[in-house]
């Protein structure tokens, strides 16, 4: 009788993560009598995957009934495959020995490759906000995919970006891989509503790439422009001075009125109006009782936006142009938001 051969007909098997791998093995003879064992890897460090004789292997099932005496099919199924299961599996026939069974013949091995989907890309931007015309960096990370081949693209509002660098790790063989990419984006004043998108394409995704997004609203700071103007009011001793705070983002803003350098009133932007581009406008006004002033008044609108150094705009109020009201020596002012007069 010809000597027993162990046949593993599949050189390689490709399985998607989460699925079941079938590793085929048959023997050409029942003799010599002895068990079959499955190992991952070869040599002294090989890992036991299944032992026909003893042990508990909850993820492994046999294709045929191995306790049947005439059985020569030693194929196994391994359930719930993960990238960590990748490797070369050997079906090994042992002959009975004492004190231990003795390895008799090994199959040629079956390489199990695991296709694993990349994790959802996570896009993160800079820790601090930046202003238009500045270049900021965004990173995109995705993990746990196999095989190594992967494509990553960056978009800003649907337009593909070209200024980015991508690394796939590790460089050598591994059960699974990670991708890390950094893109540079130049901010513009119109970017409050903009989105940066990282798109990852992989063989496991069947043409339906994964996307991660970052809103530039979390990255950009658009500093306000200030304009101070003066309008006359019906009462001839009063002047309405308006500070227009335009095109700022984010909303966090504090405004202080100064009369000749002295703080007159401080208020926080509340009832703002939003522009189409996502920036905000706000207006504050000051009702000045001109008769309370002997000399010209320098009115300053000072704005502190999003914790940044204050910016200001001044307006010189010419007192000489207004007749003074006798006996009055205090300036009247009101809050810009509800036009209440305070005397």
């Amino acid at each position: 009788e010809e000597e027993l051969q162990v046949i593993q007909p599949d050189k390689s098997v490709l399985v998607a993560a989460g699925e079941t791998a079938t590793l085929r093995c048959t023997a050409t003879s029942l003799i010599p009598v002895g068990p079959i064992q499955w190992f991952r890897g070869a040599g002294p460090g090989r890992e036991l995957i299944y032992n026909q004789k003893e042990g508990h292997f909850p993820r492994v099932t046999t294709v045929s009934e191995l306790t049947k005496r005439e059985n020569m099919d030693f194929s196994i199924r391994i359930g719930n495959i993960t990238p960590a299961d990748a490797g070369t599996y050997y079906c090994v026939k042992f002959r009975k020995g004492s004190p231990d069974d003795v390895e008799f013949k090994s199959g040629a091995g079956t390489e199990l490759s695991v296709r694993a989907k990349p994790s959802a890309p996570v896009v993160s931007g800079p820790a601090a906000r930046a202003t238009p015309q500045h270049t900021v960096s965004f990173t995109c990370e995705s993990h746990g995919f196999s095989p190594r081949d992967i494509t990553l693209k960056w978009f800003k509002n649907g337009n593909e970006l070209s200024d980015f660098q991508t690394n796939v790790d590790p460089v050598g063989e591994s059960v699974s891989y990670s991708i890390h990419s950094t893109a540079k984006v130049v901010l513009t004043r119109e970017d409050v509503h903009s989105q940066v998108i990282c798109e990852v394409a992989h063989v496991t995704l069947q043409g339906d790439p994964l996307r991660g997004t970052a809103n530039l609203s979390e990255t950009i700071r658009v500093p306000p422009t200030l304009e101070v103007t003066q309008q006359p009011v019906r009462a001839e001793n009063q002047v309405n001075v308006t500070c227009q705070v335009r095109k700022f983002y984010p909303q966090r803003l504090q405004l202080t009125w100064l009369e000749n350098g002295n703080v007159s009133r401080t208020e926080t932007a509340s009832t703002v109006t939003e522009n189409k581009d996502g920036t905000y406008n706000w207006m504050s006004w000051l009702l000045v009782n001109v008769s309370a002033h002997r000399d010209d008044v320098k009115l300053t609108c000072q704005v502190e936006h999003d914790g940044q150094p204050a910016v200001s705009k001044s307006h010189d109020l010419k007192v000489s142009a207004h007749p003074k009201e006798q006996g009055s020596n205090t300036a009247a002012e009101n809050t810009g938001s509800n036009e209440r007069n305070i005397y």
Partner: antibody, heavy 120, light 107 residues
Framework: QVQLVQSGAEVKKPGASVKVSCKAS????????IVWVRQAPGQGLEWMGW????????NYAQKLQGRVTMTTDTSTSTAYMELRSLRSDDTAVYYC?????????????WGRGTLVTVSS | DIQMTQSPSSVSASVGDRVTITCRAS??????LAWYQQKPGKAPKLLIY???NLQSGVPSRFSGSGSGTDFTLTISSLQPEDFATYYC?????????FGGGTKVEIK
């Protein structure tokens, strides 16, 4: 046909040795192990030991260690069991059997048995 | 060593009866248990291997079950030729051990 043919009955004196043969035919002798089992009159079955016909490795019952030797001759497909320093309680029918399990031990083919009587 | 305890040691039954013999191992032996039938003056004959597999040529009225430590041999409908002594045997590891036997006698 597939069979195990054992040597004939033996009468031995205490302290003597006995060598029982078991000739296999009809199958590949080296593909299977051979076990020896004995049965004293009116008693149950007692496993004596095992030998690999492929490589000659052995495993003996503790109580017989040092008194028993199992060998094979692959050229004649024959297994032998020698028991030394015989005592009266060694009187039994000695069976050889083919050990056929793949990852376990069971015996699917038996010889007819050899009666060994130890008597002074 | 693994001890094998068989019960009952004897049973009286009639042709057509259902007969059940049990065997308990002193420690877990997976499914590595065999059952033998022995008639007076004859060698044992393998009936069941690996706890539940019927040996080739053995009538289907014989069946085996169990795993771990507790095993059963069942003869579904006793026939005249079934009156004999039955032995269980653990085949998990050396030393191989047999149960004490169960004698099935005619009632």
């Amino acid at each position: 046909q597939v069979q195990l043919v054992q040597s004939g009955a033996e009468v031995k004196k205490p302290g003597a040795s006995v060598k029982v043969s078991c000739k296999a035919s009809g199958y590949t002798f080296t593909g299977y192990g051979i076990v020896w089992v004995r049965q004293a009159p009116g008693q149950g079955l007692e496993w004596m030991g095992w030998i690999s016909a492929y490589a000659g490795e052995t495993n003996y019952a503790q109580k017989l260690q040092g008194r028993v030797t199992m060998t094979t001759d692959t050229s004649t497909s024959t297994a032998y069991m020698e028991l030394r320093s015989l005592r009266s309680d060694d009187t039994a029918v000695y069976y050889c059997a083919r050990e056929a399990g793949s990852s376990w031990y069971d015996f699917d083919l038996w010889g007819r048995g050899t009666l060994v009587t130890v008597s002074s | 060593d693994i001890q094998m305890t068989q019960s009952p040691s004897s049973v009286s039954a009639s042709v057509g009866d259902r007969v059940t013999i049990t065997c308990r191992a002193s420690q877990g032996i997976s499914s590595w248990l065999a059952w033998y039938q022995q008639k007076p003056g004859k060698a044992p004959k393998l009936l069941i291997y690996a706890a539940s597999n019927l040996q080739s040529g053995v009538p289907s009225r014989f069946s085996g079950s169990g795993s771990g430590t507790d095993f059963t041999l069942t003869i579904s409908s006793l026939q005249p030729e079934d009156f004999a002594t039955y032995y269980c045997q653990q085949g998990a590891s050396f030393p191989i051990t047999f149960g004490g036997g169960t004698k099935v006698e005619i009632k």
